[in-house]
Interface confidence: low
């Protein structure tokens, strides 16, 4: 099966597919990071969820004014986090709720690892991990 089949709603909804990238980001503290969600339709607003640990359920991300910003156009939603901190570590998910069906679709997640000043090289290899 093609990889995009995983995102396709069998009912054929107008916003049944959503792709999130990158899957992993490792950056030093203080840097700015961006993560993106690509949609096949603008039929529905995108929100962002976050979880800090693998066995937690994602929860609504509270955007810190002046440091975290979300934007959305026809087919692209972007979350920008400036001056990343250790407490920003976690997995971020975009989520789209369709206007016409109220169905909800979620990206596969972007893991953010905020590094100190010595271990960034150790994790660079993770950028090449497959889904």
């Amino acid at each position: 099966a093609r990889s995009e089949d995983r995102y396709r709603n069998p009912k054929g909804s107008a916003c049944s597919r959503i792709w999130q990238s990158p899957r992993f980001i490792a950056r030093k503290r203080g840097f700015t990071v961006k993560m993106h969600c690509y949609m096949n339709s603008a039929s529905g607003n995108v929100s962002w969820l976050w979880k800090q640990e693998m066995d937690e359920n994602p929860q609504q991300l509270k955007l810190e004014k002046g440091r975290m910003e979300e934007s959305q156009n026809e087919s692209l939603a972007t979350l920008t986090i400036q001056g990343i901190r250790f407490e920003d570590n976690g997995i971020y998910f975009c989520q789209q709720k369709c206007n016409n069906t109220s169905e909800v679709y979620q990206g596969c997640g972007t893991e953010l690892r905020v590094m100190g000043f010595s271990t960034l090289a150790q994790l660079k290899q993770r950028n090449t991990l497959k889904d």
């Epitope: 066995d55 937690e56 509270k62």
Partner: antibody
Framework: EVQLLESGGGLVQPGGSLRLSCAAS????????MTWVRQAPGKGLEWVSG????????YYADSVKGRFTISRDNSKNTLFLQMNSLSAEDTAVYYC??????????????WGQGTMVTVSS | SSELTQPPSVSVSPGQTARITCSGD??????AYWYQQKSGQAPVLVIY???KRPSGIPERFSGSNSGTMATLTISGAQVEDEAAYYC???????????FGGGTKLTVL
């Protein structure tokens, strides 16, 4: 009906130990983080300790770190708080509380009625 | 760890609007939660994630969080709302949870 029933409180001498238990029922215990909160007589609420759904991650207030140990038995739907080296400052009603979700850092939506711990000689 | 600061007491007449504030450095990036505790009883969650109301909580209870200040508003306070109210959040390290000192609401 969601219920949390604490037990194990009582009178203990300074330096002594107690083990509190909290029996959970009416919800799927294994998918919620859990917390202990205490309230000294006539005082406000004080967060004591929290534990993740799996029990792997535990969190403690500075005032109890190294003396208290939180744990859970998911097979028995029970939360525990082992309290050692108790002092008069630990005298309080101890509440067991269920997290809003699986999130370690969530607030609690359901509380037990509490069990009284008195530390006195 | 961070602290949450509340006024010790607030008094209103029945039918008036009561506002209880909670200030903390971490509140711009952390959710605020509010508990009501009546004398001799366990706390009850009345507001979660800044402004959401659990089922069973009257509509007169509302919450907001702007900057470093969270506010619990009781529109048309009633005698049965007389209680201690506590705000709650995580501190900036996210490893500790913090309660405010509590505010005694008197409706007279």
């Amino acid at each position: 009906e969601v219920q949390l029933l604490e037990s194990g409180g009582g009178l203990v001498q300074p330096g002594g130990s107690l083990r509190l238990s909290c029996a959970a029922s009416g919800f799927t215990f294994t998918i919620y983080a859990m917390t202990w909160v205490r309230q000294a007589p006539g005082k406000g609420l004080e967060w004591v300790s929290g534990i993740s759904v799996s029990g792997i991650r535990t969190y403690y207030a500075d005032s109890v770190k190294g003396r208290f140990t939180i744990s859970r038995d998911n097979s028995k739907n029970t939360l525990f708080l082992q309290m050692n080296s108790l002092s008069a400052e630990d005298t309080a009603v101890y509440y067991c509380a269920k997290g809003l979700s699986s999130g370690d850092r969530d607030a609690s939506d359901i509380w037990g009625q509490g069990t009284m711990v008195t530390v006195s000689s | 760890s961070s602290e949450l600061t509340q006024p010790p007491s607030v008094s209103v007449s029945p039918g008036q609007t009561a506002r209880i504030t909670c200030s903390g450095d971490a509140l711009p990036r952390k959710y605020a939660y509010w508990y009501q505790q009546k004398s001799g009883q366990a706390p009850v969650l009345v507001i979660y994630e800044d402004s959401k109301r659990p089922s069973g909580i009257p509509e007169r209870f509302s919450g907001s969080n702007s900057g470093t200040m969270a506010t619990l508003t009781i529109s048309g306070a009633q005698v049965e709302d007389e209680a201690a109210y506590y705000c709650y959040s995580t501190d900036s390290s996210a490893n500790h949870r913090v309660f405010g000192g509590g505010t005694k609401l008197t409706v007279l």
